[in-house]
Amino acid sequence: ESLGWDIAELQLNHTGPQQDPRLYWQGGPALGRSFLRGPELDKGQLRIRRDGIYMVHIQVTLAICSSTSTSRHHHPTTLAVGICSPASRSISLLRLSFHQGCTIASQRLTPLARGDTLCTNLTGTLLPSRNTDETFFGVQWVRP
Amino acid sequence: ESLGWDIAELQLNHTGPQQDPRLYWQGGPALGRSFLRGPELDKGQLRIRRDGIYMVHIQVTLAICSSTSTSRHHHPTTLAVGICSPASRSISLLRLSFHQGCTIASQRLTPLARGDTLCTNLTGTLLPSRNTDETFFGVQWVRP
Amino acid sequence: ESLGWDIAELQLNHTGPQQDPRLYWQGGPALGRSFLRGPELDKGQLRIRRDGIYMVHIQVTLAICSSTSTSRHHHPTTLAVGICSPASRSISLLRLSFHQGCTIASQRLTPLARGDTLCTNLTGTLLPSRNTDETFFGVQWVRP
C-alpha cells in the first residue's frame, strides 16, 4: 500500500433529486465487483486521499434509451466528471453528450490532490441504468 | 516479471459460428502490435494467470456499418465482456450496445483470478472489422 | 523517474491547415491540467522518449455538432491515432468514425519506442472543440 496504489471502482447507487444532477455511487465487495482501496465515499461522492496523477474512467448507460429518446429531448443528456470540492479546485475534467447514443464511456489522466471530491453530473431527464456492467466509475493512481 | 505486470493486447482472429456469439482473439508480435505477457489464449479466449485487479479495455468496430445499419436491425447489436469460465465465476463485466454508432469502446477496473477466462460476446447479425486499429481487446494488471 | 513512469496528458492547441489532417497539441501546468513528464512535444506532435508498452487514450469532441451534422457529410469524420515518424514505423494504432455521434473516446495498449512520434489525424470538414474537458490525448508508460 505504501506504493500509493490507490484505486476504486464504483457502481451506481442512485440519482439525486431533480435539482441535484449528481450520481451517487457505492462500492464494496458485498455489492459485487466494486471496491475502494484508498479513496473513500462521502455521501456517494468519491474523495481522493492521496496526491498524484490518476486515470479516471467512466461508463454510463441510460436506462430507457433508444436513438430517438436521446435525440428528442430538448435539453441534451450530458455527463460531466469534475472536482466539485474544495470549491477552490472546482473544475470539469471530462464531459460527454449522449447525442443519438445510449452509452458514453471515456477516460483521462488528471492530477488530483488529497481531499478532492469528484462529482459525476448527469443533466437531462433520462435516468441511468444501475446494471453494474453498464454503469460504473473508477479511478486509479498511476504516479506521484 | 515478478512484479506481476501481466498484460495483453489482442487483435480479432475470427467470429464463431452462428450460435456462438464469442469473438476469437489472437496475439503475438508476428501478427502486428498485439502481444501476451502473462495471460494466455485458450481457443481464442483470454485466460488470466495471475490474481489481481485488472484494467480491461475493448474497442469493436462493425465491418459494414452506417448509422442506419445499426439502428434498423430488430435485435440491437451488443457487445458484452465477461468471465465465462469457471462457471462458478461467470458474470458480465462490461456491456455496450451499438445503437446508431458503428464503434463501441470502453474500459473498466475489475478483480480477476488465475484461471478466469474472459469472453467477448457480440450479439446481432453484424460482423466486426478485423482491422487491428479498429477492433482490439486487452487487459492490464494494475495491483494485487 | 528511473522507474520509467513516462506520462503525458495534452490539450488541443489548434488544427492544421486544410491539407494537414493532424491535430496540434499542447501541455503544461500553466495551460490547465495538461502535463508532460517524459514524453515531449515536437511542433505539436507527441514524441516518445522511453521504450515500453503504453496505454494511449484519446477523446475528441466536434465543436459545432449535432447528430445530423456528423451524418449528413459525404466524407465521414474520422479520427486516427498512429505513429507518423520515423517513416519506417508508420502505422495506424487506433481509428474511430463519428457516425451520428459528436464525441469519440477510446484507449489501447501498444508498444512504442524512443523517437516514435504520434499523430492524431482528424479527417472531414468538422472541427474539434478545444474545451479541455471535451478533447484531450494522453499516453502512460505501463511496463517495459
Partner: antibody, heavy 119, light 107 residues
C-alpha cells in the same frame, strides 16, 4: 419537520381562473423541485409537471401546457399552480409533491386542494 | 410516454391474507418503480421505491419485486389499516406516469 401546506378548496365558474398555493417549510425551498399532481374525482394520479425552484424554469407534461402555469415566490417558500379558462374537466384535487434523495420519488406531499368548476 | 397497467383494479381480502398487486410497464423501466398508498381524502404516501426498497417507517409486511416491465407489490399479512388505494409509478423518465390504482377492501 418538512411540510407542504396547500391553500383551501375553491369553487369556480367555467372560464374563471384559480391559483393554488403550496407553502414549504422545514427545508431550504430552493434546493428541491416542486411537482404538481392532479387527481380527478374517483380517478388515478396524473403528473402535471414540475418547477425548478432554483431557476424558476417550469416543465409541463403534455396536456398541461397553455392554461396551466407554475410559478414561485421564493421569499415566501411558496410554489403556485395557476389554471386559467377553467373547464368542468379541471375539477380535481391538485397536490404538490417533493422528492428527498431519489429522482422522481415523492416522499412529501401537500394535503391537496380541491378545485371544483361548476356553473 | 410509458403506460403503466395495474391489476386488479379492486380486490377484497381478509385480515391476515397475503395480497398481491401487479403493475406492467409498456417498456422496460429498469427497476425505477415506486408504490404509494392513498387513503380517502388524503395525499398519497410513499411505501416502496426502486422496486423493492422500503421507505423509512413503512411496516415490513409491505414488499415489492420485479424487473423489466413486470412488477409486484405484496402485503404479506393484511391489516385493517391497510385499506386504501395503491398506485404504482414509473420514475425512469418524464413524463412520470402512474398506474390507474388498485382499491383494496376488507372482506
Amino acid at each position: 419537520q418538512i411540510q407542504l401546506v396547500q391553500s383551501g378548496s375553491e369553487l369556480k365558474k367555467p372560464g374563471a381562473s384559480v391559483k393554488v398555493s403550496c407553502k414549504a417549510s422545514g427545508y431550504t425551498f430552493t434546493n428541491y423541485g416542486m411537482n404538481w399532481v392532479r387527481q380527478a374525482p374517483g380517478q388515478g394520479l396524473e403528473w402535471m409537471g414540475w418547477i425548478n425552484t432554483y431557476t424558476g424554469e417550469p416543465t409541463y407534461a403534455d396536456g398541461f401546457t397553455g392554461r396551466f402555469v407554475f410559478s414561485l415566490d421564493t421569499s415566501a417558500s411558496t410554489a403556485y399552480l395557476q389554471i386559467s379558462s377553467l373547464k368542468a374537466e379541471d375539477t380535481a384535487v391538485y397536490f404538490c409533491a417533493r422528492e428527498e434523495d431519489y429522482r422522481y420519488v415523492f416522499n412529501y406531499w401537500g394535503q391537496g386542494t380541491l378545485v371544483t368548476v361548476s356553473s | 410516454d410509458i403506460q403503466m397497467t395495474q391489476s386488479p383494479s379492486s380486490l377484497s381480502a381478509s385480515v391476515g391474507d397475503r395480497v398481491t398487486i401487479t403493475c406492467q410497464a409498456s417498456q422496460d423501466i429498469s427497476n425505477y418503480l415506486n408504490w404509494y398508498q392513498q387513503k380517502p381524502g388524503k395525499a398519497p404516501k410513499l411505501l416502496i421505491y426502486d422496486t423493492s426498497r422500503l421507505h423509512a417507517g413503512v411496516p415490513s409486511r409491505f414488499s415489492g419485486s420485479g424487473s423489466g416491465t413486470d412488477y409486484t407489490f405484496t402485503i404479506s399479512s393484511l391489516q385493517p389499516e391497510d385499506i386504501a388505494t395503491y398506485f404504482c409509478q414509473q420514475g425512469v423518465t418524464l413524463p412520470l406516469t402512474f398506474g390507474q390504482g388498485t382499491k383494496l377492501e376488507i372482506k
